[in-house]
């Protein structure tokens, strides 16, 4: 969610805006809801259909291999570096994802699936 400061006299000073949610399907005209204390506001917005078709996901990352299992947490991690973002998507440049350590067979399967995210 995005925060923005709008000063209008004694009104709310900081509105928090949610994502643009299309009224039907996954793109086109829709609404964005804003909240500030007890106040709420809805504004029209538009998710361009061409962007949805082009990118599918807002943020695409290239991931390293999974690290070794951390015995203390029972998880392993890997880092992803931003590869491509939808033009208006405010993506982190790097992300870190974790997953539970599992048996070798399951790990191989999951790692293969993970490569598809590159």
């Amino acid at each position: 969610k995005k925060k923005e400061k709008v000063k209008k006299g004694s009104e709310c000073s900081e509105w928090t805006w949610g994502p643009c949610t299309p009224s039907s399907k996954d793109c086109g005209m829709g609404f964005r809801e804003g909240t500030c204390g007890a106040q709420t506001q809805r504004v029209h917005c538009k998710v361009p259909c061409n962007w949805k078709k082009e990118f599918g996901a807002d943020c695409k990352y290239k991931f390293e291999s999974w690290g070794a299992c951390d015995g203390s947490t029972g998880t392993k991690a890997r880092q992803g570096t931003l590869k491509k973002a939808r033009y208006n998507a405010q993506c982190q440049e790097t992300i870190r994802v974790t997953k539970p350590c599992t048996s070798k067979t399951k790990s191989k399967t999951k790692a293969k699936k993970g490569k598809g995210k590159d």
Epitope: K83, A85, N88
Partner: antibody, heavy 117, light 107 residues
Framework: QVQLVQSGAEVKKPGHSVKVSCKAS????????MNWVRQAPGQGLEWIGM????????ILNQKFKDKATLTVDISTSTAYMELSSPRSEDTAVYYC??????????WGQGTLVTVSS | EIVLTQSPATLSLSPGERATLSCRAS??????LHWYQQKPGQAPRLLIK???QSISGIPARFSGSGPGTDFTLTISSVEPEDFAVYYC?????????FGGGTKLEIK
Amino acid sequence: QVQLVQSGAEVKKPGHSVKVSCKASGQSFSSYWMNWVRQAPGQGLEWIGMIHPSDSETILNQKFKDKATLTVDISTSTAYMELSSPRSEDTAVYYCSSWSAKRGDFWGQGTLVTVSS
Amino acid sequence: EIVLTQSPATLSLSPGERATLSCRASESISNNLHWYQQKPGQAPRLLIKYASQSISGIPARFSGSGPGTDFTLTISSVEPEDFAVYYCQQSNSWPLTFGGGTKLEIK
């Protein structure tokens, strides 16, 4: 931070194509959209199009679909814009800019292209 | 394409005064509106992104409001270095478009 350095001024005769380069240094060149914008003398800003270095996906302003060609060379972190068959009305300063919705953008210094017979 | 109309075309103010620049979109563009400052012989500089989000290194006197169709760039107290041309740009749909600009000049 990203630094964008553009090629020098060009003087071309009408019909002779011109290629402007934009070399990036600093943060990852391949992660961000590269926009091209032009500004005719004394006029406002006009968007030509953009290209994503990761896969060379290009989105052009329809006005420039037969005029501009955008390319990138990942190995040298350089973006290019080629103007085919330029006319006198294509005389302008051409800018490249690297866009990230999260951090904002960085602009090249601009390249003046003069088309004159 | 989305047309952005900026007003006034020219704004004459003295240093220390408050500047209010307007940008109106021909249709709703949510908060996908950005403000640029350009000085003669220089590339544009991003001041505000997504209607009201501040940019690192830009003085706090610059602020923006939106979303929808009507957007405002406010300079709370104009400094001598602020006299320049200001452009709004939308990134809601292709082609990206710019407003015609507002020239902020010394009164």
